[in-house]
């Protein structure tokens, strides 16, 4: 990119550059028209018969350098061939010299700085590539010369350019003073500012475009070369912020349209909102869940929205005394999630009718909640209680939902309690053929003991045919027809309205060997 400091083609007023010395044959300003019929200013000199050593100087106005370190001067000029000039002496030249002088302000006068090399700095002696020929009475013909010179390095606020003629017949048609700068550049969503190179190459820090954020790694930079070109090199660059995608050749970030989102910064484009979500504004980093749908805290921002599951189905119960096995089917609606678990709530009602949450004496296997399989075993049920179990299905968003959790209920009533096992059997009398037994009345929770059943057999006779039973309504019994001096194993169970209780522990008793021993009370 070129930034113009002076372009005589664009000057509408007289240039009024300074000439030295004030003598005839000096540079003179002329006006004319360019190709577009715009008025342009030129300078002309033609003192080919000048005195030896006489130079004609022409100096521009003061030109602020505007931060440029090197300035370029493009000269357009025509040069009359010395042979075309009938009056041209040996002093006729076909070259001229260009100088510059730096200053911090427009301080030059008609006489200062001294019109000579040092203080003026010589840039170049310019020779014409194309000479213009002039024949008497005919129009001059010849090409325009174009020469670009480089001035610098410059350090002061501005400078003057000067032209020294030492015997040429020439016209300076235009002067274009400019410096080169690297134009503002946007690449990889990184904006590099317009930069005037101060050296061969200058590192330039970039900044992210609007709605972009720096990519990981070193901050982006690019090199501006002295010729005003950016050096080609990879740029780490920036990436569009969440809710924005790269557009227009990676030069800007565009907000995601309604109904789309981009959850993270970086590459990638806006995506349609996932299931059960929507975005009503542009620039969404996340889509809002529809009413009744949620994202768990651990769900990615781009995950679909999900809902709690429906209730489990078809709960089946199998009661076994004080144990209960519950089993059910998965819910019809999982809510769109894989993290399905089950939980149980329990209420118990006593025989009298008062109900409360289940007590701590119940145990659940594997547990009352966070069940991943659709079953549980409940132990410690109390007899003659009615239990209500509510089986719920849960997932990662159940805790976010408001309102009641759907459940599948099951009611189970346990049997009334049978009497406890009878223990503490005593032999009150024994004979060679009989045994009299007594025991304590067990405490039956569900009503009085109606009767007892005594089960006995001779020790060593294990088969079912050797086992005998005796019923008694009292808490005692006499076993007759026993073998002399034999050992017997005895068990007793009690019966209430709830049914028989379990047999107690086996009690070991022995008959007498002969009658002479008589009845003898024995304590087992």
């Amino acid at each position: 990119l070129e930034e113009t400091l002076l372009n005589t083609k664009l000057e509408t007023a007289d240039l009024k550059w300074v000439t030295f010395p004030q003598v005839d044959g000096q540079w003179e300003e002329l006006s004319g028209l360019d190709e577009e019929q715009h008025s342009v200013r030129t300078y002309e000199v033609c003192d080919v018969q000048r005195a030896p050593g006489q130079a004609h100087w022409l100096r521009t106005g003061w030109v602020p350098r505007r931060g440029a370190v090197h300035v370029y001067a493009t000269l357009r000029f025509t040069m009359l061939e010395c042979l075309s000039l009938p009056r041209a002496g040996r002093s006729c030249k076909e070259t001229f010299t260009v100088f510059y002088y730096e200053s911090d302000a427009d301080t030059a006068t008609a006489l200062t700085p001294a019109w000579m090399e040092n203080p003026y700095i010589k840039v170049d002696t310019v020779a014409a590539e194309h000479l213009t020929r002039k024949r008497p009475g005919a129009e001059a013909t010849g090409k325009v010369n174009v020469k670009t010179l480089r001035l610098g390095p410059l350090s002061k606020a501005g400078f003057y350019l000067a032209f020294q003629d030492q015997g040429a017949c020439m016209a300076l048609l235009s002067l274009h003073l400019f410096y080169k700068k690297c134009a503002q550049l946007t690449v990889n969503l990184t904006r590099f500012p317009e930069t005037v190179p101060r050296e061969l190459v200058v590192p330039v820090a970039g900044s992210c475009v609007v709605d972009a954020v720096p990519a990981p790694g070193p901050s982006p930079s690019l090199y501006c070369r002295e010729d005003g070109q950016w050096a080609e090199q990879p740029v780490t660059g920036c990436s569009c912020a969440p809710g924005f995608e790269a557009a227009e050749g990676n030069t800007k970030c565009r907000a995601c349209a309604q109904g789309t989102f981009k959850p993270l910064s970086g590459e990638g484009s806006c995506q349609p909102c996932p299931a059960n979500s929507h975005s009503n504004t542009i620039g969404s980093a996340v889509c809002q869940c529809r009413v009744g749908y949620f994202r768990a805290r651990t769900d990615p921002r781009g995950a679909p929205c999900t809902t709690p599951p429906s209730a489990p189905r078809s709960v089946v119960s199998r009661l076994n005394g004080s144990s209960l096995h519950l089993e059910w089917s998965a819910p019809l609606e999982s809510g769109g999630r894989e993290d399905l678990t089950y939980a149980l709530r329990c209420r118990e009602c006593r025989p009298g009718g008062s109900c409360a949450p289940c007590g701590g004496d119940l145990t659940f296997d594997p547990g009352p909640r966070d069940l991943v399989e659709p079953w549980v075993v409940v132990r410690g049920l109390r007899p003659d209680f009615t239990y209500t179990f509510e089986v719920t299905a849960l997932n990662g968003v159940s805790s976010l939902a408001t309102g009641p959790v759907p459940f599948e209920p099951v009611n189970v009533t346990t049997d009334r309690e049978v009497p406890p096992a009878v223990s503490d059997i005593r032999v009150t009398r024994s004979s060679p053929s009989s045994l009299s037994l007594a025991w304590a009345v067990p405490r039956a929770p569900s009503g009085a003991v109606l009767d007892y059943e005594v089960k006995y057999h001779e020790k060593g006779a294990e088969g079912p045919s050797s086992v005998r039973f005796l019923k008694t309504s009292e808490n005692r019994a006499e076993l007759r027809g026993l073998k002399r001096g034999a050992s017997y194993l005895v068990q007793v169970r009690a019966r209430s309205e709830a049914g028989y209780g379990p047999f107690g522990q086996e009690h070991h008793s022995q008959t007498q060997l002969d009658e002479s021993e008589g009845w003898r009370e024995q304590l087992a």
Epitope: A13, D14, E29, S31, T42
Partner: antibody, heavy 126, light 108 residues
Framework: QVQLVESGGGLVQPGGSLRLSCAAS????????MSWVRQAPGKGLEWVSN????????GYADSVKGRFTISRDNSKNTLYLQMNSLRAEDTAVYYC???????????????????WGQGTLVTVSS | DIELTQPPSVSVAPGQTARISCSGD??????VHWYQQKPGQAPVLVIY???KRPSGIPERFSGSNSGNTATLTISGTQAEDEADYYC???????????FGGGTKLTVL
């Protein structure tokens, strides 16, 4: 010798037309930009019109634009001013003037008039 | 466009210095030319490019231009210098020319 001689002036009624001529001699006419300048009786100088060497550029003062036409015939070394729709305020001595010439590039000229004719009087009156 | 303003008249004793001014906005940034016109004659260029003198013009004629004012100076004024003097410059409009109103120089 180097000179410019105007002719064609005279008395003309308002709304009428007149054509002035300026014959150049003693210099290369086809290298010179030319102009017309007028001077009303007892008044100052007023620039009227310019023409470049090739005749493809012309410029006019606002007071005459659309009514006057400058032209030249380089083969006859003559400059012209065609004046139409003349008004009383156009009454003046009309001078033909040469602009300062370039050494060799006739696309350009100096901004001063370095040669003048003796003038011709144009009177617009009924 | 620029307007050039001159005093209508200036008087000077013979041998003295006459100064005729020509003013206009930022006139110092434009080249000013001066013309002398004697009664019944065509104008003659006496100063061009602010301060240059055409060949044949006496050295007593000089010019300067800065700020908003250009000045024609006649040193050692002679009776033959009595005339009307006009300044001129480019206008900002392409290639157009404007004249000052003229100053009548009287040599007493």
């Amino acid at each position: 010798q180097v000179q410019l001689v105007e002719s064609g002036g005279g008395l003309v009624q308002p709304g009428g037309s007149l054509r002035l001529s300026c014959a150049a001699s003693g210099f290369t006419f086809n290298n010179a930009w030319m102009s017309w300048v007028r001077q009303a009786p007892g008044k100052g100088l007023e620039w009227v019109s310019n023409i470049n060497v090739q005749g493809d550029y012309t410029g006019y003062a606002d007071s005459v634009k659309g009514r006057f036409t400058i032209s030249r015939d380089n083969s006859k070394n003559t400059l012209y001013l065609q004046m139409n729709s003349l008004r009383a305020e156009d009454t003046a001595v009309y001078y033909c003037a040469r602009k300062g010439m370039s050494f060799y590039n006739n696309k350009y000229a100096k901004s001063m008039f370095d040669l003048w004719g003796q003038g011709t009087l144009v009177t617009v009156s009924s | 466009d620029i307007e050039l303003t001159q005093p209508p008249s200036v008087s000077v004793a013979p041998g003295q210095t006459a100064r005729i001014s020509c003013s206009g906005d930022n006139l110092g940034k434009k080249y000013v030319h001066w013309y002398q016109q004697k009664p019944g004659q065509a104008p003659v260029l006496v100063i061009y490019y602010d301060s240059k003198r055409p060949s044949g013009i006496p050295e007593r004629f000089s010019g300067s231009n800065s700020g908003n004012t250009a000045t024609l100076t006649i040193s050692g004024t002679q009776a033959e210098d009595e005339a009307d003097y006009y300044c001129s410059a480019w206008t900002t409009t392409m290639m157009h020319i404007v004249f000052g109103g003229g100053t009548k120089l009287t040599v007493l």
